[in-house]
């Protein structure tokens, strides 16, 4: 807290300008009117205030707006945003995408801070859903943003927003998140033709069920091994050797390099060795000829 002291004669600030950088902390407190500061916030960024001076300016705004800053002030906070705590930000009501962009710009190039996370949370909750423009903005600043959301939060993403998602935005997503995003992507891209559809849906396939993979295998998509390895194990296991061969096309020979990695390893164990041999890749570990496979899980379900 800065002590309340009278402003020295002739030092009362008429506007926010460079002369203020020579003011001591107590002079800033005494000589700068909070209402003036609020209306001229856009000038603060152009002035090389010290961190201590910025603390004083923040204190003045806090006194003027104890219930939270209005958006007109928030939009022009600039580097003063870095002084805000998540508790401060929870009092705000940010509705403009321009305001959001302005504040994200301040933190650009850095990890997502607790302040930024709180700001985004407030903004998205205020909008009710993660619309395309917001998603575009957030992933531009933080490519990993989408994957930082819980499956519950992702459920509020409308299918139309999926068009804004780039492959790199999904790099750190786990299967639970892709389980939520995949049906939305399937819906979003449903009117595209085969090859174009595959290019768009490819990054989301970690959430695809078996029946969709079977359908893809009929479309000459030539899935690469990196994509195949990201598929859900439970979705891959029921695929036949013929279906996997069609799904991978010329990339099928890559199964050899990944034969000990899941889901390839688990899939091999489920196939008849005779069928695996037809691939000519030397894949071993399939079910020997003459053995009967009992699906015990199916038996339990029936009893």
């Amino acid at each position: 807290e800065v002590e309340k002291t009278a402003c020295p004669s002739g030092k009362k600030a008429r506007e926010i300008d460079e002369s203020l950088i020579f003011y001591k902390k107590w002079e800033l407190e005494a000589c700068v009117d909070a209402a003036l500061l609020a209306t001229q916030m856009d000038r603060v960024n152009a002035i090389p205030f010290t961190y201590e001076q910025l603390d004083v300016l923040k204190h003045k705004l806090d006194e003027l707006y104890p219930q939270g800053y209005p958006e007109s002030v928030i939009q022009h906070l600039g580097y003063l945003f870095l002084k805000m705590s998540p508790e401060d930000i929870r009092k705000w009501n940010v509705t403009s995408l321009e305001t959001l962009k302005a504040l994200l710009e301040v933190n650009k190039g850095h990890e997502m801070s607790p302040q930024v996370a709180t700001l985004i949370d407030r903004f998205v909750k205020g909008r009710g859903q993660l619309d395309k423009d917001t998603l575009d903005t957030l992933t531009a600043f933080y490519p990993g943003y989408l994957c930082s959301l819980s499956p519950e939060e992702l459920s509020s993403v409308p299918p139309s927003s999926i068009w804004a998602v780039r492959p790199q935005d999904l790099d750190t997503c786990d299967p639970r998140q892709l389980d939520v995003l995949y049906p939305k992507a399937r819906l979003a891209f449903q009117n595209m033709n085969g090859s174009e559809y595959f290019v768009k849906i490819q990054s989301f396939l970690g959430g695809a069920p078996t029946e969709d993979l079977k359908a893809l295998s009929q479309q000459n998509v030539s899935m690469d091994l990196a994509t195949f390895m990201k598929l859900r194990t439970d979705a891959v296991l029921p695929l036949t050797v013929a279906e996997v061969q069609k799904l991978l096309g010329p990339h099928v020979e890559g199964l050899k390099a990944e034969e000990r990695h899941r889901p390839v390893r688990d899939w091999i164990l489920r196939q008849r060795q005779d069928d695996l041999d037809t691939l000519g890749l030397g894949l071993q570990g399939g079910i020997p000829n003459g053995y009967l496979v009992l699906d015990l899980s199916m038996q339990e379900a029936l009893s």
Partner: antibody, heavy 119, light 108 residues
Framework: EVQLQQSGPELVKPGASVKIPCKAS????????MDWVKQSRGKSLEWIGD????????IYNQKFEGRATLTVDKYSSTAYMELRGLTSEDTAVYFC????????????WGTGTTVTVSS | QLVLTQSPAIMSASPGEKVTLTCSAS???????LSWYLQKPGSSPKLWIY???NLASGVPARFSGSGSGTSYSLTISSMEAEDAASYFC?????????FGGGTKLEIK
Amino acid sequence: EVQLQQSGPELVKPGASVKIPCKASGYTITDYNMDWVKQSRGKSLEWIGDVFPYNGDSIYNQKFEGRATLTVDKYSSTAYMELRGLTSEDTAVYFCARRKTGTGYFDVWGTGTTVTVSS
Amino acid sequence: QLVLTQSPAIMSASPGEKVTLTCSASSSVSSTYLSWYLQKPGSSPKLWIYSTSNLASGVPARFSGSGSGTSYSLTISSMEAEDAASYFCHQWSSYPYTFGGGTKLEIK
């Protein structure tokens, strides 16, 4: 430019452990496997194992099974190899190497980390 | 494990000379699964040839690779000073992946 940056030399005591980082840049780490290779002084290369960064699934050369652990932090695009119970036989240069998933050759190699085990 | 034996262990060649390095496998390896790496002192290995005969990006055309089954080779049609290095063959046909002992090629 695709690069795999490894840490500087390590001097460790027998019985101790070492964890070597390999920072990937210029590509998406989850789209390729990351393998690790040992090279003892003046000797050939020895494959330790590999990890698929997307799901962290790792496989090992039986010789290193139980002593080596391969992990990945997707968020920082960094792969790690931890080797435990070190002996003088583990004195070597350790390389991380990128492997295009579905192939068995290493198209980009790390800078190498020299580990010296000595009391 | 599948053993790869390289010969000779060390050899020297004059500039312009044709050079052949060999790699012999203890059991059959599909040609898709054999590659070669070059390594210079103090540096990391570099992919040089993959799938027996495909040159990696940036490898001069004087290099070639051939072979099948248990016998593979790397050939330099006309030796140059910059080709002096150690060459390692590598197989990924069976686990664990293995490398040959290497051939150190020197310039005369």
